[in-house]
Structure formats: C-alpha cells, structure tokens
C-alpha cells in the first residue's frame, strides 16, 4: 500500500512534489508498512478493541487562518477514557481513587510500555530495531526520553505526510508559502505501541485555511454603550476601535502595518500606523465602516523578465497550472509583497445617555420610630437622551461587596433632573453606584457617602 491509499485525502500535483511543497514532509506516493501499521477502515469492528477500557478521542486544532507564507500550527490532544491518564514515563495509568464502569482497578497500569520495552529483544544496543520505525520505514529519532513516547502521529494533507513520535499531545508547524489558497483538509491518524507493532487508536480531520488576505478582527468599545456586540453605538461619545491581526506565527512582526479607516460619515479617510483609533459620530443613522490593513510581507519574487523572443516560434508548454508557487523562482531572494486585510461593519448611531452627575444629596429627616435607618435623596442630572430606569448599587467603601441593589423605572422631563431616594441601614461610609439607562445606553456615576449617626445635628457628607 501507498500512503495515499491509507490516508483518504488529497494528493499533490507533480509540480508540488518536485518542489517539496511542505518543508520536511514526504510524498504520499511512498510505501506504507501495513504489517507494522495495520490499516482499518471506518466501521471496522477492530476499532472497538483498539484501546483498553473504551475509545480514545483525538482532538485536532490549528491556529488557522494562516496568511500565505506564515506558519500554521496543528495540535493533537488525545483524550483517554475516564480514569485514565499518561504518567511521567509515558505509561497509561488509572487515576487514583477514580471509579469507572469497571469499578476501581487493582492493576495501576492500562498500558505499561516501560515494561514492554525492557522485555523487548532484537535490538542492537542503539535502541534501533526493525520495529522502532515509522510507517514508511524511517527510524524513530532518538532524542532523550524517546522511549517514553508511545504514540505515532501521521499527519496528511495536500498529498504529503509528516510522521511524529510523541506523547498524548503533539504539535506540528507547517510553512504555508506554497499551499493553495482556500480551505484545506488536515487528517491525522494516531497509533499506539503494541509489542513490536502498532495499533491505530484514533483518526481525526479538520479544515484549515490559507489565505492571501490578512486575517483582521476589530473590537469596538464605547463608554455608556449598553451592548457592545450589537454594533449600535451612541452619538457624541468616542468609540474605540481596536484592530487585532491574527498572526500567531509572528510572520508580520517586522512589517510596517498601515490602517486605513473610512467611518462612512463623510469625515474622509484616516490613515494610521496605530492599531487603535477613536472616532466620534455626531449624527444619528446607519454608517458603513471600512478598514483596510496593509502590510509588506515576505512573499514570492516576481518572475524574471522573459528572454528575447527567438525568430522561430517555439512550442507552448501548455497551461502552467494554478499553483501560486510558480512565482517563486529563486528561493533565497528576499522579496516583499503587499498583503491586505479588510474589515467592514454597519454601525448604527443613536441617541444615548452621555453623562450623569449627582449634584446634591440631602438627608431626609425621618420620624423617631426608625432611628437605625437614614433616607437620602440624590438629585441627579443627565445629558443626552432621557433615561427610562435608574439603578442604585450600595456597597462597602471599597465598592466591591454589594449590600443592596434597587432598580426602578423613572419618568423624567426634558431637563433630565430627577431625585432618587434610597435607604441606608445604619451609619458608616458607603459606595453608591448610580446608573441611568435606556434601551441602548447605561451611564454610571459613583460617589462615596458618609452616613452619620442619627443625631439631627450631624450633617450628611460626601466622603470624596
């Protein structure tokens, strides 16, 4: 059998194979040793018994999307059946005091590979033997502690494969310089040691993406905005836009990145090298926000100029194919290519409560039967739209431990002047958070107040 017969995935074009499309990977035209590494199709009954105590699940993730030319990293994590874990020696053991369907196990080991490898014969002193090899026959690399690595991972994509010896978690990075743009499929098959052979325990596949557009994400934040995820913001308050470029392999670390903003409100273009920007919309309405990110990234070099035309016509070699690699003639050249990323959003701007202030606090004198309580009136003003509810949160002087929260609807006139009456149980210093809200906004003000003992002569004080 060949690798591509075993791993149901794409195979490479001849061009890709000749140019070693994925550095350090091998062509799936290579032979697969089925005696050492048996191949089971989906639904084969042998999968049921491939692992003691249940099925192993492999979870494949990647830091996709990857900008073409950058590295993409794939991680595989094995999830063992309940109560099983890998120990420091790479053996699979039962967790102490963990009860599964079979109850508590007397044997501490699920798989004691250390004992197996000590019993193993046929080695020549270097740890090399006919069975310490990958499916294509290449010997295992002998880093320190390699005997504690009991899983063999075979990664397969775009007609190439990569073999790795590892523990219950491995990572593999691939350079995407020559990978076709668009969604691709990565497939991983995992084997475990089994005497002098190997047994498949899990197969997993995942889509990853290679793109020529810079992956851009924008977060938007505005003070007093009630819901930052609904793309509705308030007039006359700055919105902070923060651009995150998804570049986990730091491919663009040495690139100058330019951000070109159009806020859609006829304020023109704003160009910056800073990933954050503030913008205030002064009109209500719907606006189209556009961001273009530009970075000079390492890229393929342009083809050399064509040689002078011969007088006799030469036969055409036919289509060159659609492989982006064909631009790259001289691998050692350092060429730059402008890459662009785009972000678009439709932003709705509405009236909102812009500001709230406590302008006066008054101790309301209460009749004698309630000596422990103090009633306090807060006179509050606001700017912007008219609030529909008021909330007060009364907490300790650090403003961390809430003692009391009261919300109530309010009916406020155009002047936005209202009185909020609240009860304080006992004297002391309190933190008061007062919020005025409507459908789209929530404006907050805070104050520390000192409530005196109930001596009519002692005045109410604002602690700050």
């Amino acid at each position: 059998k060949r690798f591509h017969d075993v791993l149901g995935n794409e195979r490479p074009s001849a061009y890709m194979r000749e140019h070693n499309q994925l550095n350090g990977w091998s062509s799936d035209e290579n032979d697969w040793n089925e005696k050492l590494y048996p191949v089971w199709k989906r639904g084969d009954m042998r999968w049921k018994n491939s692992w003691k105590g249940g099925r192993v699940q492999a979870v494949l993730t990647s830091d996709s999307p990857a900008l073409v030319g950058s590295n993409i990293t794939f991680a595989v994590n094995l999830i063992f059946p309940r109560c099983q874990k890998e120990d420091a020696n790479g053996n699979i053991v039962y967790e102490k005091n963990c009860r599964n369907e079979a109850g508590l196990s007397a044997d501490p080991y699920v798989y004691n590979w250390t004992a197996w490898s000590e019993d193993s014969d046929g080695e020549n002193g270097t740890g090399q033997s006919h069975h310490n090899v990958f499916p294509d026959g290449k010997p295992f690399p002998h880093h320190p502690g390699w005997r504690r690595w009991n899983f063999i991972y075979v990664f397969h994509t775009l007609g190439q494969y990569f073999q790795k010896l590892g523990r219950c978690s491995v990572r593999v990075s691939v350079n995407t310089a020559n990978v076709t743009l668009g969604p691709q499929l990565m497939e991983v098959t995992v084997y475990r040691r089994h005497g002098r052979a190997y047994v498949p325990i899990a197969q997993v596949k995942d889509v990853y993406v290679v793109t020529d557009q810079i992956p851009v994400f924008v977060t938007m934040f505005q003070k007093n905005d009630r819901n930052s995820s609904d793309e509705t913001f308030l007039k006359d308050l700055p919105i902070m836009f923060d651009v995150l470029i998804h570049d986990p392999s730091h491919f663009l670390n040495y690139s100058t990145i330019n951000y070109k903003w159009s806020f859609g409100d006829n304020t023109g273009l704003f160009v910056s090298t800073n990933h954050t920007v503030n913008h205030t919309y002064v009109l209500n309405g719907t606006f189209s926000l556009n961001l273009t990110v530009k970075a000079a990234a390492p890229g393929p070099c342009p083809p050399p100029p064509p040689p002078p035309r011969p007088s006799k016509p030469t036969p055409s070699l036919g289509p060159a194919g659609d492989n982006p690699l064909e631009l790259s003639r001289i691998p050692d050249e350092n060429c730059q290519i402008n890459r662009y990323g785009h972000f678009q959003a439709t932003i709705t701007i509405v009236e909102g409560i812009l500001e709230v202030n406590i302008i006066q606090m008054t101790d309301v004198l209460m009749p004698v039967p309630w000596p422990e309580s103090s009633l306090i009136d807060f006179v509050v003003t606001c700017q912007g739209s008219i609030p529909t509810e008021v909330c007060t949160i009364i907490s300790d002087p650090t403003c961390e431990i809430t003692q009391n929260t009261v919300c109530s609807p309010v009916d406020v006139d155009e002047m936005c002047l209202l009185t909020v009456r609240r009860t304080f149980n006992g004297s002391g210093t309190y933190c008061v958070n007062l919020t005025l809200g409507d459908d789209t906004s929530l404006a907050l003000t805070s104050t520390l107040i000192s409530v005196p003992d109930r001596d009519p002569a002692s005045p109410l004080r604002m602690a700050n």
Partner: antibody, heavy 115, light 107 residues
C-alpha cells in the same frame, strides 16, 4: 486555466440509471476532491457527495448513499457520478465542483427523468 | 444534517445600493462557510470561503462576515452584473449543505 467539462444532457425513463462525467484540465487531477451538486428546476443546490480521485475515497450524502456511485479515472482525469433508480424528482442540472468547498464548477449536465 | 437558512429569499435593489444577505446555521459551523453567485442558466461561481475571504478575482465590494451560526454576505455598492442568486454553503460536516438562495433583482 482550470476547466471542468461535463457530458451532455440526458433524458431517462423512471427506474433507469444515468452516468454523468466531468473531465478536468488545467491542474493536476489527483490533488483535489471533486464534489457533485445538483439543482432541480427553480430550486436550490443540493450536495450529492465528493470523491478523492487519488484513491477513490468517497463521502456521500445519506440521501443518495444507496443510489449514487462516484468513480474517478486518473488516466483521463475524469470523474463520474452514476445515479440509479431514477425518479421524476431527480430531474435536475448536475454539477461537478473542484476542491473541498468548490472553487471551480463544471458547466452542468441536465438530466430529465420522464416517462 | 446542518440546516442553512438564508434570508431574504428575494430582494429588490438598485444599482449603487448596499445589500446584505444573511445565512443562519442550525448548529455551530465555526467559519466553514462559502458564498456562491449564480446567474440563470449558468454554474455557480465561488465568491467567499471561510466566511470572510474573497477568492482571487472577486471584486472587493463583496464581503463576508460571521462565525458560529450567523453569517452575512454584503455587497457594498451594487453593480448591474451583481443581479443574480446567491447561495451560502457550510462545509464543517458531512453532508455539506446549502442555503435556499437569495434572488437579487433590479428594483
């Protein structure tokens, strides 16, 4: 440039089978999956399945699992989709599409099932 | 199977308009969504992959966004050649499924 050229229109009787072909050029055939998608008159797109031409590995929509068969001939860079036990509701345009999510499509083959 | 619910099913607009088409998946598909344009009697044409990335040659007035279950295709300023039917597709899990389509007509 990438091209997918499909076979011509077919008229079939209910119960019969039809075999539609899709010949690929402009790229190396065995590199990409090939999808089959159909579109009934005035309707949306329906995914039938996909084949990996390098090893005839297939994925089918369960709806078509028992009636559709996809094959590939690497010597001619052609994929085939055969649909058996045809009924009138199989009347549709059948498309082949290259890659995991199709980036290039064939021109379509009209299959009419009528008694 | 994952259902892809596209809305609206039809839409009238004028040249120069900004148009938004939405697609809702019945379960999480991450960003494994593509958008296609189809004109009468023609095969679909791929516009967007992975929810937001344009295929080369696709004009930048087309943009895609979304993740998880909610996806949007936006045409920022309609051109005469954009009047067509648009489909979304999920390729997160088999069987791959398409939205019902949005027919974009001249007002």
């Amino acid at each position: 440039q990438v091209q997918l050229v499909q076979s011509g229109a077919e008229v079939k009787k209910p119960g019969a089978s039809v075999k539609v072909s899709c010949k690929a050029s402009g790229y190396t055939f065995t590199t990409y999956w090939m999808n089959w998608v159909r579109q009934a008159p005035g309707q949306g797109l329906e995914w039938i399945g996909a084949i990996n031409p390098s090893n005839d590995y297939t994925e089918y929509n369960q709806k078509f699992k028992d009636r559709a068969t996809m094959t590939a001939d690497t010597s001619t860079s052609t994929v085939y989709m055969e649909l058996s036990s045809l009924r009138s509701e199989d009347t549709a345009v059948y498309y082949c599409g290259r890659s995991y999510s199709p980036d290039y499509w064939g021109q379509g083959t009209t299959v009419t099932v009528s008694s | 199977d994952i259902q892809m619910t596209q809305s609206p099913s039809s839409l009238s607009a004028s040249v120069g308009d900004r148009v938004t088409i939405t697609c809702k998946a019945s379960q999480n598909v991450d960003n494994h969504v593509a958008w296609f344009q189809q004109k009468p009697g023609k095969a679909p044409k791929a516009l967007i992959y992975s929810a937001s990335y344009r295929y080369s040659g696709v004009p930048d007035r087309f943009s895609g966004s979304g993740s998880g279950t909610d996806f949007t295709l936006t045409i920022s300023s309609l051109q005469p050649e954009d009047f067509a039917t648009y489909f979304c597709q999920q390729y997160k899990s088999y069987p791959f499924t398409f939205g019902g389509g949005t027919k974009l007509e001249i007002k």
